[in-house]
């Protein structure tokens, strides 16, 4: 097969660092899966570079990635999800670097959504709820969630809570009164599938009641 780079191009190419990372998202668009790869060095000259995946596919031996700006991706139903695939950076027919990867070990879930916080006056607590598209999925159903919250004025003092459900109760006495809080949540595969944290959900902001002077409790 043709498509070879000029010799000089290849010599230059071999001086570069073509290390890359990838993540998969299963059933991200109906029954379609996606695979996204990018170079770890943002300054790599990606002109004439392509990504190709071979093995552990249905119907075809290899697939070419689509390039969008500086990321490369595939969206397809045709991942076998059993065994390892070989993902290569190519110039024409020449492979510059390759990785053998099981796509079930690089799963990045979709970000949780519909995060909200409701104050229960009688119970003196806050009920945090959120949703995840993974409840409806066939493959990556079981997730660990990381709820992070902070007082808005505390730039980097996040408190993290790990949970497997989509509901969390925060006790009022654990929070500062009359304060504005920011809360967000992300997810990671927790059963069979392995991988990475999702993106964070959009943040939700809520205010704690002031202290009721007579009882010492918050209003």
């Amino acid at each position: 097969e043709s498509g070879y780079a000029q010799n000089g191009d290849l010599e230059d190419a071999e001086l570069d660092d073509y290390s890359f990372s990838c993540y998969s998202q299963l059933e991200v668009n109906g029954s379609q899966h996606s695979l996204t790869c990018a170079f770890e060095d943002p300054d790599v000259n990606t002109t004439n570079l392509e990504f190709e995946i071979c093995g552990a596919l249905v119907e075809v031996k290899c697939l070419n990635f689509r390039k969008l700006q500086e990321i490369y991706f595939i969206e397809t139903k045709k991942f076998l999800l059993i065994g390892k695939s070989n993902i290569c950076v190519k110039v024409g027919e020449k492979s510059l670097t390759c990785k053998k990867i099981d796509l079930t070990t690089i799963v990045k879930p979709e970000a949780p959504f519909d995060l909200s916080v409701i104050y229960r006056e009688g119970a003196n607590d806050f009920v945090v709820t959120f949703n995840t598209s993974h409840l409806q999925k066939k493959y990556v159903k079981v997730l660990m969630h990381d709820v992070a919250y902070r007082q808005e004025k505390d730039e980097n003092k996040w408190t993290h809570v790990n949970l497997s459900s989509t509901k969390l109760t925060l006790l009022q006495r654990k929070l500062q009164p009359a304060a504005m809080y920011e809360i967000k949540v992300r997810s990671i595969p927790d059963h069979y599938f392995k991988g990475f944290w999702s993106e964070w959900s959009p943040s939700y902001y809520f205010r704690t009641p002031e202290i009721n002077n007579s009882s010492g409790e918050m209003d």
């Epitope: 097969e1 043709s2 498509g3 004439n48 392509e50 596919l57 249905v58 119907e59 075809v60 031996k61 290899c62 697939l63 070419n64 990635f65 689509r66 390039k67 595939i74 397809t76 045709k78 190519k90 024409g92 027919e93």
Partner: antibody
């Protein structure tokens, strides 16, 4: 609607050259792998060449490798096949064809041109 | 390279008959198989891909099946417009390859 129109066929002597063109419309050429497929008179279909959506990868069977070159000009909505060192056995109707699926490389073809006849004879 | 063996090369049948065409590959193509119909002087038309997925607009009397190295195109009740030549094609790997064709003629 999707259209593929081949041109450039004709009579050429053995050892000669010919350049086929395929003008496409009704879809974004840069999204698709494209292929040339030929059919000798009274014979079956034979795959001749494929070019990736980006144009960076080209594929050929042994029967034409080194003699034929596939290329594309997405800006001109055109696919080409440069045929050199032509032989009598290259005589065929040449079709350009578009895969059903965009990107990636699933090479089954839902749109075909009407074909252009190439005759190699002295 | 993957070899394609299509059979029969021709067959005679009547309107209403059930027709079966087979395609055997020299190695597992993991359902990377398509079927086409071609009429004289015309370009081929895609009927089936992924071994068993009917292309949009193709009548439901056509069906594809198979896995591994053995694949079948079935016409459940042959219609007058179905008399044509049929080709299988593997797209699992390069070089892409077509079967030799099956000409379906009127008995």
């Amino acid at each position: 609607q999707v259209q593929l129109v081949e041109s450039g066929g004709g009579l050429v002597k053995p050892g000669g050259s010919l350049r086929l063109s395929c003008a496409v419309s009704g879809f974004t050429l840069s999204d698709y792998y494209m292929a040339w497929i030929r059919q000798a008179p009274g014979k079956g279909l034979e795959w001749v060449s494929t070019i990736s959506a980006s144009g960076l990868r080209t594929y050929y069977p042994d029967s034409v490798k080194g003699r034929f070159t596939i290329s594309r000009d997405n800006a001109k909505n055109s696919l080409y096949l440069q045929m050199n060192s032509l032989r009598a056995e290259d005589t065929a109707v040449y079709y350009c064809a578009r895969p059903l699926s965009a990107h990636y490389g699933f090479n089954y073809f839902d749109y075909w041109g009407q074909g252009t006849l190439v005759t190699v004879s002295s | 390279d993957i070899q394609m063996t299509q059979s029969p090369s021709s067959l005679s049948a009547s309107v209403g008959d059930r027709v079966t065409i087979t395609c055997r590959t020299s190695e597992d193509i993991y359902q990377g198989l398509a079927w086409y119909q071609q009429k004289p002087g015309k370009a081929p038309k895609l009927l089936v891909y992924s071994a068993n997925t009917l292309h949009i607009g193709v009548p439901s009397r056509f069906s594809g099946s198979g896995s591994g190295t053995d694949y079948t195109l079935t016409i459940s009740s042959l219609q007058p417009e179905d008399f044509a030549t049929y080709y299988c094609q593997q797209y699992y790997d390069y070089p892409l390859a077509f079967g030799g064709g099956t000409k379906v003629e009127i008995k």
